[in-house]
């Protein structure tokens, strides 16, 4: 099943002490999915979307960006036929830099 979209969302961090907010969105035909946020292959957080929403926002406490492990990825899972869990491909990576550029 298709990979989710991942994006850093406001309020953007201006230093390593600020919290990080990362949204992960599945295609619209997968509402209510379970989402996992990874950093360097390690699970950071798990969240389930409400049944009428296609994504979640992971809120990471200040200092999260100091931990080693590289970029963030996310993935979602849905129940397929025979109640078997199907996992999406991994999202593209998102890197956190300071300050985050705005147009």
């Amino acid at each position: 099943i298709p990979a989710p979209s991942i994006r850093l969302v406001p309020p953007y961090p201006s230093s390593q002490e600020d919290p990080i907010h990362i949204a992960c969105m599945a295609p619209g035909n997968f509402p209510g999915a379970n989402f996992t946020l990874y950093r360097g292959g390690q699970v950071v957080q798990l969240l389930q979307a409400p049944t009428d929403q296609r994504g979640v926002t992971f809120n990471l406490s200040g200092g999260s960006s100091k931990a080693p492990g590289g970029p963030f990825h996310c993935q979602y899972g849905v129940l397929g036929e025979l109640n078997q869990s199907q996992l999406s491909d991994l999202s593209e990576p998102v890197n956190v830099s300071f300050p985050v550029p705005t147009w």
């Epitope: 979209s5 994006r7 969302v9 949204a23 969105m25 295609p27 619209g28 509402p31 409400p50 009428d52 929403q53 296609r54 994504g55 926002t57 593209e92 705005t102 147009w103």
Partner: antibody
Framework: EVQLVETGGGLIQPGRSLRLSCVAS????????MHWVRQAPGKELEWVAV????????QYAYSVKGRFTISRDNSKNTLYLEMNILGPEDTAVYFC???????????????WGQGTTVTVSS | DIQMTQSPSSLSASVGDRVTITCQAS??????LNWYQQHPGKAPKLLIY???YSEIGVPSRFSGGGSGTDFTFTINNLQPDDFATYYC?????????FGPGTKVDIK
Amino acid sequence: EVQLVETGGGLIQPGRSLRLSCVASDFRFSNHAMHWVRQAPGKELEWVAVISSDGSNRQYAYSVKGRFTISRDNSKNTLYLEMNILGPEDTAVYFCVRSHLGPEWYYGMDVWGQGTTVTVSS
Amino acid sequence: DIQMTQSPSSLSASVGDRVTITCQASHDIRKFLNWYQQHPGKAPKLLIYDAAYSEIGVPSRFSGGGSGTDFTFTINNLQPDDFATYYCQQYESLPFTFGPGTKVDIK
């Protein structure tokens, strides 16, 4: 079927105020961010404003900031746009638009209402 | 603000034709792009989101692709109801911005 029905448009004199309403049905309104988008006669589409699902976050286009206020009443499944100091450049069809299955602006937009026409003229 | 440009601004085609429209963003918008269809006097209808995903119920003859700054929208086997104006729109950042539209009319 998801429906958005806008009302409140009409002919108004420059400098006056108007309030548009949009009633939502057949979806959980309180779980979705909502937008207003306008289209002047024969022109392209212009995003106007957005409000998050709980009403805590509101953002505006530069052209309306300080004059327009977006608000919502989740108990009435209704979105509002209060428009003050209207000018001829605000003449347009105003569309109410649902966020694409999400509580904030960054989910994009999916379902549109049929629009309500605002004409600003003396 | 992110500027969106579309080409062509209009085109003439016949039923059964294949039509391709391009959209360009002034900054990288990754895949945060919608395509809409609008008939005269009607509201826009979402066809494609996240650059390439078809909205539920949209016929498979409509497709989209691209990422970053360059995007395409294709209609295969053009049908009578497809004669309309098509808009791209970015939602990478606020304010959301739309392309100027491409009017597809009958040759």
